[in-house]
């Protein structure tokens, strides 16, 4: 495939990545799938600078990111290492609360109204942010 050199329509470019900000809500798995169908992934926050950029665009609204612990340890959807990477959890989070009776914990991470992160029940219909890297080869065949 060819390298993507500019962001798709309605996506916002920032630091060699493209971001798309939803204006409706979906459960985490549905949001994850939406981004994948756009040849992207749920946003992976790797720096304080990126955190501030995303926070500016989403405002004080609960919003899914590409971080989950549905299979045990916390993982970023693009494989970025969680342990050594940037984190911005609320105090006392993540707590993986099991008390809601869902037969599982709070396995999906989201930006809260103040931008800090919380883990929550993955079924909540929060807004979401997709991200794709400009330098990534797109899946479209090159123009002949």
């Amino acid at each position: 495939g060819s390298e993507r050199t500019c962001c798709p329509v309605n996506w916002v470019e920032h630091e060699r990545s493209c971001y798309w900000f939803s204006r409706s809500g979906k459960a985490w798995a549905d949001a994850d799938n939406y981004c994948r169908l756009e040849d992207a992934h749920l946003v992976v926050v790797t720096s304080w600078e990126e955190q501030k950029f995303v926070q500016h665009h989403i405002g004080p609204v609960n919003t899914w990111m590409g971080l989950h612990d549905q299979n045990g340890p916390w993982k970023w959807v693009d494989g970025t290492d969680y342990e050594t990477g940037f984190k911005n959890w609320r105090p006392e989070q993540p707590d993986d609360w099991y008390g809601h009776g869902l037969g599982g914990g709070e396995d999906c991470a989201h930006f809260t109204d103040d931008g800090r992160w919380n883990d929550d029940v993955c079924q909540r219909p929060y807004r979401w942010v997709c991200e794709t890297e400009l330098d990534k080869a797109s899946q479209e065949p090159p123009l002949l």
Partner: antibody, heavy 126, light 107 residues
Framework: QVQLVQSGAEVKKPGASVKVSCKAS????????INWVRQATGQGLEWMGW????????GYAQKFQGRVTMTWNTSISTAYMELSSLRSEDTAVYYC???????????????????WGQGTTVTVSS | DIQMTQSPSSLSASVGDRVTITCRAS??????LAWFQQKPGKAPKSLIY???SLQSGVPSKFSGSGSGTDFTLTINSLQPEDFATYYC?????????FGPGTKVDIK
């Protein structure tokens, strides 16, 4: 048994604030959301927002953003809804309702507002 | 926001009748829909969740169907205690929203 008991009726002047309480019993307070829903006389149901005392998360309908604050006191299993800058159109019965997610076969899910308070009448009049 | 509409807004029926109420969402909501019954001066009561699943303790004469944007609540063999207002409610997206209600009264 599981129940939500709300505070008594309030009469307020325009511009004032009102704080309605909702005391939960018969279940683990932190295991569920509390939703707030209001109903003007002869009108339908209007969802105002939700709060979760465990994750300390809240979500408000845009219409009430900036005017509503939902809080809680886990030690007494009580949720609160405060509405400020009251106007006559805020005259309504305000309900709290317990909410929670549950899983269905096939990894589907639903959200259940299964237990409601008795309602608190708020009258805004000069 | 997702708009919910209901029809009819009111209907008159007799004891023993079969009643059907429809609810339409302004966009697809899968099966993330509930139905509530409300009697005058009382809090709403949950009847149906996930469009078609009956809440425990609710008689089987109530049934729900539909997916996407169009949903139906059916009450078989209407009894005096069923005369009330019925609301549909979507929890597919925030803000959660309710339909305007359908009032079922005695003919």
């Amino acid at each position: 048994q599981v129940q939500l008991v709300q505070s008594g009726a309030e009469v307020k002047k325009p511009g004032a604030s009102v704080k309605v309480s909702c005391k939960a019993s018969g279940y683990t307070f932190t295991s569920y959301d509390i939703n707030w829903v209001r109903q003007a006389t002869g009108q339908g149901l209007e969802w105002m927002g939700w709060m979760n005392p465990n994750s300390r998360n809240t979500g408000y309908a845009q219409k009430f953003q900036g005017r509503v604050t939902m809080t809680w006191n886990t030690s007494i299993s009580t949720a609160y809804m405060e509405l400020s800058s009251l106007r006559s159109e805020d005259t309504a019965v305000y309900y709290c309702a317990r909410g929670g997610y549950d899983v269905l076969p096939g990894n589907n899910y639903y959200y259940d507002m299964d237990v409601w308070g008795q309602g608190t009448t708020v009258t805004v009049s000069s | 926001d997702i708009q919910m509409t209901q029809s009819p807004s009111s209907l008159s029926a007799s004891v023993g009748d079969r009643v059907t109420i429809t609810c339409r969402a302004s966009q697809g909501i899968s099966n993330y829909l509930a139905w509530f019954q409300q009697k005058p001066g009382k809090a709403p009561k949950s009847l149906i969740y996930a469009a078609s699943s009956l809440q425990s303790g609710v008689p089987s004469k109530f049934s729900g169907s539909g997916s996407g944007t169009d949903f139906t609540l059916t009450i078989n063999s209407l009894q005096p205690e069923d005369f009330a207002t019925y609301y549909c409610h979507q929890y597919n997206d925030y803000p959660f929203t309710f339909g305007p209600g359908t009032k079922v009264d005695i003919k």
